[in-house]
Interface confidence: medium
């Protein structure tokens, strides 16, 4: 009688259910009635992450420094190598195949979120009352200076790129 359903860790071969190979091992030979599934450990630089019937192990990912990548965690027999971008760069896609330098927030824009190895800098326009006069990957929008607090008067209004200019109150001549 053929096997009608195989278990989660088994697969059908003719009328039998054979055991899948565990993570870290590849399939060499299917089982027969009198022999178990033959599995073999993946080699150096290879992995398989699931219960499987794969004839070949997958190669560990290479973190290419020429693409701005470095190793975040070394691969094992059952996990792939994970890569991240070097300092000052972030991934160009969710698979992180390559990296690109972090974007700068231009004058008039401040940093809302500092870049990580995975995500680029997030900029935001400086709202009224705030300014940024530099191109930066770190600087937030700064609040305009309060001339009043300093006992000074505003001589030039601020913009999203410039601070207000304060000065002494000019006395009326008699």
């Amino acid at each position: 009688e053929p096997a009608t359903a195989c278990g989660e860790k088994q697969y059908p071969v003719n009328s039998l259910c054979c055991d899948l190979c565990p993570p870290g091992q590849k399939l060499v030979n299917d089982c027969t009635e009198v022999s178990k599934t033959e599995c073999q450990s993946c080699g150096k630089g290879e992995f398989l992450s699931t219960w499987n019937r794969e004839k070949y192990c997958h190669e560990h990912r290479y973190c290419n420094p020429n693409l701005g990548l470095r190793i975040q965690s070394e691969g094992t027999l059952n996990t792939d190598t994970t890569c991240v971008c070097v300092e000052g760069q972030h991934c160009t896609s969710h698979t992180c195949e390559s990296c690109t330098p972090h974007s700068l927030c231009l004058p008039g824009f401040g940093v809302k979120q500092i870049a990580t190895g995975l995500l680029d800098t997030v900029c935001e326009p400086c709202p009224l009352g705030f300014f940024s006069n530099v191109s930066s990957a770190f600087e937030k929008c700064h609040r305009w200076t309060s001339c009043e607090r300093k006992g000074l008067v505003e001589q030039h209004v601020g913009t999203n790129k410039t601070d207000v200019v304060c000065g002494f109150q000019s006395r009326m001549r008699t």
């Epitope: 009688e1 096997a3 195989c6 278990g7 989660e8 860790k9 088994q10 009328s15 039998l16 259910c17 054979c18 055991d19 089982c31 027969t32 009635e33 009198v34 022999s35 178990k36 599934t37």
Partner: antibody
Framework: EVKLVESGGVLVKPGGSLKLSCAAS????????MSWVRQTPEKRLEWVAS???????YYPDSVKGRFTISRNNARNILYLQMSSLRSEDTAMYYC???????????????WGQGTSVTVSS | DIVLTQSPASLAVSLGQRATISCKAS??????????MNWYQQKPGQPPKVLIY???NLESGIPARFSGSGSGTDFTLNIHPVEEEDAATYYC?????????FGGGTKLEIK
């Protein structure tokens, strides 16, 4: 009706050889795995050898290299060639049909009446 | 090898009563949701006959008074109500690991 009939069991001296046969009828012999199981004088049951429908064989360490299981699908006969026999091989030898749901799920659903093997000087 | 220990080695049960036979494995015989334990009955001068397969499945043609239970390392064969013809030796057998192994047997006598 499934029928298994063993033959070939005799008294043999230690170090000697013997070939057991099992004639099968009443089922498609070539489609089934077959096994030899022995029962010692103390009534303990021991798995001796198995052969798959595809011809693959399996032996426990206790008989590996000394016993050979084979089959003739054209004649519906199962064999067990035994050599370098020891006193501990003395037993009733049964031929059994093995049904497998999967490799682990073997069940011996039909047995012959057995043939007696005595190893003694 | 997986060692199967049956208890008791022998028991006497009155007609119509319950017979309970235990089989303990030295390691689990479970795999992927199934328990690979079989039970056989052997009467004097006869070969063994399968009663239960995969711990609790009744072999075709076997009376419903035979039942099997258990998982992991502890298994039980129950016979209720016991009849005269049940006088025999009962063996458990595991098939999850090579080599397949049998218990030492339990001899049931009917009082």
């Amino acid at each position: 009706e499934v029928k298994l009939v063993e033959s070939g069991g005799v008294l043999v001296k230690p170090g000697g050889s013997l070939k057991l046969s099992c004639a099968a009828s009443g089922f498609t012999f070539s489609s089934y795995a077959m096994s030899w199981v022995r029962q010692t004088p103390e009534k303990r049951l021991e798995w001796v050898a198995s052969i798959g429908s595809g011809g693959g064989t399996y032996y426990p360490d206790s008989v590996k290299g000394r016993f050979t299981i084979s089959r003739n699908n054209a004649r519906n006969i199962l064999y067990l060639q035994m050599s370098s026999l020891r006193s501990e091989d003395t037993a009733m030898y049964y031929c059994a049909r093995a049904y497998y749901r999967n490799h682990r799920g073997s069940v011996m659903d039909y047995w012959g009446q057995g043939t007696s093997v005595t190893v003694s000087s | 090898d997986i060692v199967l220990t049956q208890s008791p080695a022998s028991l006497a049960v009155s007609l119509g009563q319950r017979a309970t036979i235990s089989c303990k494995a030295s390691q689990t015989v479970d795999y992927d949701g199934d328990s690979y334990m079989n039970w056989y009955q052997q009467k004097p001068g006869q070969p063994p006959k399968v009663l239960i397969y995969s711990a609790s499945n009744l072999e075709s043609g076997i009376p419903a008074r035979f039942s099997g239970s258990g998982s992991g390392t502890d298994f039980t064969l129950n016979i209720h109500p016991v009849e005269e013809e049940d006088a025999a030796t009962y063996y458990c057998q595991q098939s999850t690991e090579d080599p397949p192994t049998f218990g030492g047997g339990t001899k049931l006598e009917i009082k």
